[in-house]
Interface confidence: low
């Protein structure tokens, strides 16, 4: 067969969907891969071909759009399932061509199952709610195109598995829930079930999303810094190894960067000719604020390691610090016969 | 890295035509729109027309349809702009920019090409 | 067509100060496929902004975009030497494209 720009599989789009239920896939070409769109493409005279690959086999097959009912269909850039089967599951690949371009990718689809609890192999997005901030909301995710907006369909909100009715502070109002206050106890798995008709038939539209209570914006601080500090004096002779934990708090700050680095001599370790190795450890609480441990080990230290200014710093969006560690090197004790002997004038 | 490279100035009379080419190098070529933009001296940018290289079919803007033809050639990664029937007021830096793929805005643009059009 | 007018026409600033450009289009752009495009003396412009708000690659974060709709803003937070230039903005949302006429920020 003639050259085609194959984009091989794209494993960024893993697309899971549930049994029996509606499914639209755009082709993924039009939304990563080129610079057009379907309707540009389709007015130039290149044409859509679908195609796929069952699981566990090797052979491309075309797909049946002559189903009964008309299961599987395509609409411009979508394939449409009303409804899956657990048995769609596979490699699915989309193809632009005419007799002189052709471009295609692959993506995976994967038919899961669900049990009356919503639980499922189905990866959950995540939704971070702040704690105690006031009202906030979560959408029902991913529903639009299924129906037009001229049908209404009914929206059935759970946690876990039950129904969301007479909660104290989460109130269903349509496609979205309202937390009125978010607290911890708010923290596990919300589905939204819609429902609605599509030629005489009824399609149920499965949407679940873990919500996590974070750290609220007004509580959040810049980086503390809480080792080394002015109470720890690092004490070390020649030849012993020194170690310095650096540990630092911080806020949870929705898409913040945290950092930790440390400097010696206002370089970085990788710039210094020592052997330093620095290791990390990263604990979260229950609301996501982060403690971050570098310690900084030198195996056998020298004097003038010893002279050197070791310095910790922090950064987050709320701001940069910074504090150095006291090291000194350890004056040895006294020997008997030579030092006091000296001192008391004996020859 | 994808750079544009454009060809070298030029003068020309009234009433004839000239041709400006954009070569592209080191990237993908045929699937993103190459456009033009030129610049009378002292004045501002404006958009003349653009060519996506897979479809070869180019739009232009309305006061240039009829003088303006834009032209891909994909194996020389090559676009292409021909303007006829030259007046004094087309005196202009001609410029060729990438329409991009992540920002579908003009994230590359050529170093510009003069064309002087002088009796 | 969409007519972005750009204001004001030039920018007397010095370095350090803050720069707030404005354009308005005649019409809504769809999209929001607006961008904003930096212009040095004898150079080819620079894309700095696209989709009203989204820094192009390797501009420094100084520069950022806001507005919808018809109304757009281009600020500059802290003004370096190198940033007194001729500003454009730009809809790529409906053909024609159409640009705006340029503010010039210049040094005071």
């Known amino acids: 067969s003639e050259r085609c720009d194959d984009w091989g599989l794209d494993t960024m789009r893993q697309i899971q969907v549930f049994e029996d239920e509606p499914a639209r896939i755009k082709c993924p070409l039009f939304e990563h891969f080129l610079k057009f769109n379907y309707s540009t493409a389709h007015s130039a005279g290149l044409t859509l071909i679908w195609y796929w690959t069952r699981q566990d086999r090797d052979l491309e097959e075309p797909i049946n759009f002559r189903l009964p009912e008309n299961r599987i269909s395509k609409e411009k850039d979508v394939l449409w399932f009303r409804p899956t089967l657990l048995n769609d599951t596979g490699n699915y690949t989309c193809m632009l061509r005419n007799t002189t371009y052709c471009s295609k990718v692959a993506f995976p689809l994967e038919v899961v199952q669900k049990d009356s609890c919503f639980n499922s192999p189905m990866k959950l997005p995540v939704h971070k709610l702040y704690i105690e901030y006031g009202i906030q909301r979560i959408t029902c995710p991913n529903v639009d195109g299924y129906f037009p907006s001229s049908v209404k369909p009914t929206i059935t909100w759970y946690m876990g598995c039950y129904k969301i009715q007479n909660f104290n502070n989460v109130i269903p109002e349509g496609m979205n829930l309202s937390f009125l206050i978010a607290f911890i106890s708010n923290n596990g798995n919300y589905t939204c079930v819609v429902t609605y008709p599509e030629n005489g038939r009824t399609f149920h539209l499965t949407r679940t999303l873990t919500v996590k209570v974070v750290g609220s914006p007004k509580n959040a601080v810049p980086p503390v810094i809480h080792s080394p500090n002015d109470h720890v004096v690092y004490e070390k002779e020649p030849g012993e190894e020194l170690l310095i934990p650096c540990t630092v708090y911080f806020s949870f700050l929705m898409d913040s960067r945290n950092e930790v680095w440390w400097t010696i001599d206002g370089k970085k370790p990788d710039d210094i000719p020592i052997d330093v190795t620095i290791n990390e450890s990263i604990s979260h609480s229950r609301t996501e604020d982060e403690t971050r441990t570098q310690i900084l080990s030198i195996k056998k230290v020298t004097s003038e390691d010893l002279k050197r200014s070791y310095v910790c710093h922090a950064r987050s969006a709320k701001g940069e610090v910074a504090k150095a560690a006291t090291v000194k090197q350890k004056v040895p004790a006294p020997r008997y016969t030579v030092e006091l002997a000296c001192g008391f004038g004996a020859t | 890295q994808v750079q544009l490279l454009q060809s070298g100035a030029e003068v020309k009379k009234p009433g004839s035509s000239v041709k400006v080419s954009c070569k592209a190098s080191?990237?993908?070529?045929?699937?993103?729109?190459i456009d033009w933009v030129r610049q009378a001296p002292g004045q501002g940018l404006e958009w003349m027309g653009g060519i996506i290289p897979i479809f070869g079919t180019a739009n232009s803007a309305q006061k240039f349809q009829g003088r303006v033809t834009i032209t891909a050639d994909k194996s020389t990664s090559t676009a292409y702009m021909e303007l006829s029937s030259l007046r004094s007021e087309d005196t202009a830096v001609y410029y060729c920019?990438?329409?991009?793929?992540?920002?579908?805005?003009?994230?590359?643009w050529g170093q510009g090409t003069m064309v002087t059009v002088s009796s | 067509e969409i007519v972005l007018t750009q204001s004001p026409g030039t920018l007397s600033l010095s370095p350090g100060e803050r720069a707030t450009l404005s354009c308005r289009a005649s019409l809504s752009v769809s999209s929001n496929y607006l961008a904003w495009f930096q212009q040095r003396p004898g150079q080819a412009p620079r894309l700095l902004i696209y989709g009203v708000s989204r820094r192009a690659t390797g501009i420094p974060d100084r520069f950022s975009g806001s507005g919808s709709g018809t109304d757009f803003t281009l600020t500059i937070s802290r003004l370096e030497p190198e940033d007194f230039a001729v500003y454009y903005c730009q809809q790529y949302g409906s053909s024609p494209l159409t640009f705006g006429g340029g503010t010039k920020v210049e040094i005071k």
């Open positions: 080191g990237g993908t070529f045929s699937i993103y729109a």
């Open positions: 920019a990438r329409n991009g793929a992540t920002s579908d805005a003009f994230d590359m």
